[in-house]
């Protein structure tokens, strides 16, 4: 005789709203095996029994959570196999607050995961990330759990909130932090992530004074044309392949400023470009370390900057100045950013 359950796992996680079939079958040398599911809640799925097999269909409702047992018998011999079914809900519904962070302020950031099940601190974890690393020095405040207001009865989904007090984001501040929420289930790990952009000063590498009327730039790592009027490089994952950077920067209206483009394919070359009319020139005025150690090419409204020998850009601030007018654009390049190798 052979007794089989498919899928064979003793624990199965099912996303809410999705269906799953668990087939239990048995072959019998002398006659037909009798196979049936027991330990079923009246609402736990539906069973279709055939000669020698029984199919349990789970509809992906929270009420489907349970541990049914398949029992197979052949003559005097019997076998059984239990399956722990866990129905979970983990939609990509993260909400962060505030919408952006201001460097130089002691502040609390919160991250809420909506419509979650199970609402178990042991299965759901929150992390505040800088690049791919946990933000050192952030202090986790107490988590909160509240039941969501449901339109339909019988679906007790929850929202879970984690708050952190932020350490000083440093000078210069990073372009963004990320809230990462991970749900750990039997043989399944799910993760969602939400960006929390950091406001950046447009005109100075110093951290912004919160009382100043300086315009700010809101940097975002969403992909768009690689044109910048300020800080716009986000930390890349530490493991290849590295995505090509193509950030978008949202800025307040202001004077015509030079724009900085990055070309990762060219071994980290930066191009500063002015398009504010004729007679405008641009030049690089600031780079990490000594500006003289970089390779510069300046041609009127365009100025290039690259590292010699070719390699990753040094972490820190790059500044390009436009004349006449003296408007500057600052770009922050974080550390450990390695360009794609040319192929």
């Amino acid at each position: 005789q052979s007794f089989q359950v498919n899928p064979p796992e003793s624990e199965v996680a099912v996303a809410m709203g999705t269906s799953l079939q668990i087939t239990c079958s048995m072959s019998c040398d002398e006659g037909v095996a009798r196979v049936h599911w027991r330990g079923l809640d009246t609402s736990l799925g539906s069973v279709q029994t055939l000669p020698g097999s029984s199919i349990l269909s789970v509809r992906g409702m929270l009420s489907d959570t349970g541990t049914p047992v398949c029992v197979g018998s052949c003559g005097s011999r019997s076998f059984q196999h239990s399956v722990k079914i866990l129905v979970y809900a983990f939609p990509d519904q993260l909400v962060v607050s505030p919408e952006f962070l201001v460097p130089g302020q002691d502040q609390v950031v919160s991250c809420t995961a909506h419509n979650i099940w199970p609402a178990d601190p042991n299965s759901l974890s929150f992390a505040l990330l800088l690049g791919e690393q946990r933000l050192e020095g952030a202090q986790a405040l107490e988590p909160e759990q509240e039941e969501e207001i449901q339109e339909a009865e019988g679906t007790p989904l929850f929202r879970m909130t984690q708050r952190w007090r932020l350490p000083s984001l440093g000078t210069p501040a990073p372009p963004a932090l990320h809230c990462q929420v991970t749900m750990q289930l039997p043989k399944l790990v799910l993760t969602h992530r939400k960006e929390i952009p950091v406001l950046q000063s447009q005109t100075s590498p110093k951290p912004p004074n919160t009382t100043s009327a300086e315009p700010y730039i809101l940097t975002s790592s969403s992909t768009a044309e690689a044109v910048s009027t300020g800080l716009n490089i986000t930390t890349l994952p530490s493991a290849p392949p590295y995505p090509k950077l193509s950030p978008r920067t949202l800025s307040s209206e202001g004077p015509c400023r030079p724009k900085i483009h990055q070309d990762l394919e060219a071994g980290w070359e930066l191009l500063c470009e002015a398009s504010c009319g004729p007679g405008v020139t641009v030049r690089w005025t600031l780079a990490p370390g000594d500006l003289a150690t970089y390779h510069k090419r300046e041609a009127g409204a365009q100025a290039w900057l690259s590292v010699l020998p070719p390699g990753p850009m040094v972490e820190g601030w790059f500044q390009c100045r436009q004349d006449p007018g003296g408007e500057v654009t600052n770009l922050y390049v974080p550390g450990q950013v390695t360009p794609n190798s040319s192929s």
Epitope: V108, G137, Q139, L141
Partner: antibody
Framework: EVQLLESGGGLVQPGGSLRLSCAAS????????MHWVRQAPGKGLEWVSY????????NYADSVKGRFTISRDNSKNTLYLQMNSLRAEDTAVYYC????????????WGKGTTVTVSS | DIQMTQSPSSLSASVGDRVTITCRAS??????LAWYQQKPGKAPKLLIY???SLQSGVPSRFSGSGSGTDFTLTISSLQPEDFATYYC?????????FGQGTKVEIK
């Protein structure tokens, strides 16, 4: 000089109430989160509650949740702890402590005030 | 909650001795750990923060080390005024928690 000075302790019967105060001086009080920490006789330190500088965030140890309320009056540079439904196990020296922004350790402590809950 | 366990709970030492107190967290607290000194009838006094940074005004014979779950407070040469109880505290997440204390007594 940065100073914290607690007051309001005393002897109270079980089920009774008491309000502790902590007067701060020598620093911009509203810029700092503040804590209450207690120490039962012969025992170790136990964190009780915190409050943020603008009173927007508060939290309590499970042992006092629903019975104690932390508050502050930034115009008076004073921190408060309203203690209701007091129990014998709340007997302790209560300290107020200042929280260091960006690092979150308690860098300045008051001298403490003694609360005795006994019939 | 994160549990903090100090060892030993008490120790006897002489003036001039090198004293080491350990503190273990039940889960990683990174470097979010402070050490306090408390004398009888007095308030705790901050010695070390961020695991190894010496608080202003604290003698340099005090030092801290460690990260993650295992931390150490060292007094390089014990002085008469150092006889006291020492507490570690994690402030990585709430509720903040203290070790049970280590009493340093005169031998």
């Amino acid at each position: 000089e940065v100073q914290l000075l607690e007051s309001g302790g005393g002897l109270v019967q079980p089920g009774g109430s008491l309000r502790l105060s902590c007067a701060a001086s020598g620093f911009t009080f509203s810029d700092f989160w503040m804590h209450w920490v207690r120490q039962a006789p012969g025992k170790g330190l136990e964190w009780v509650s915190y409050i943020s500088g603008d009173s927007g965030y508060t939290n309590y140890a499970d042992s006092v949740k629903g019975r104690f309320t932390i508050s502050r009056d930034n115009s008076k540079n004073t921190l408060y702890l309203q203690m209701n439904s007091l129990r014998a196990e709340d007997t302790a020296v209560y300290y107020c402590a200042r929280d260091r922004p960006y690092y979150y350790y308690m860098d300045v402590w008051g001298k403490g005030t003694t609360v005795t809950v006994s019939s | 909650d994160i549990q903090m366990t100090q060892s030993p709970s008490s120790l006897s030492a002489s003036v001039g001795d090198r004293v080491t107190i350990t503190c273990r967290a039940s889960q990683s607290v990174s470097r979010s750990l402070a050490w306090y000194q408390q004398k009888p009838g007095k308030a705790p006094k901050l010695l070390i923060y961020a695991a190894s940074s010496l608080q202003s005004g604290v003698p340099s014979r005090f030092s801290g080390s460690g990260s993650g779950t295992d931390f150490t407070l060292t007094i390089s040469s014990l002085q008469p005024e150092d006889f006291a109880t020492y507490y570690c505290q994690q402030y990585k997440s709430y509720p903040v928690t203290f070790g049970q204390g280590t009493k340093v007594e005169i031998k």
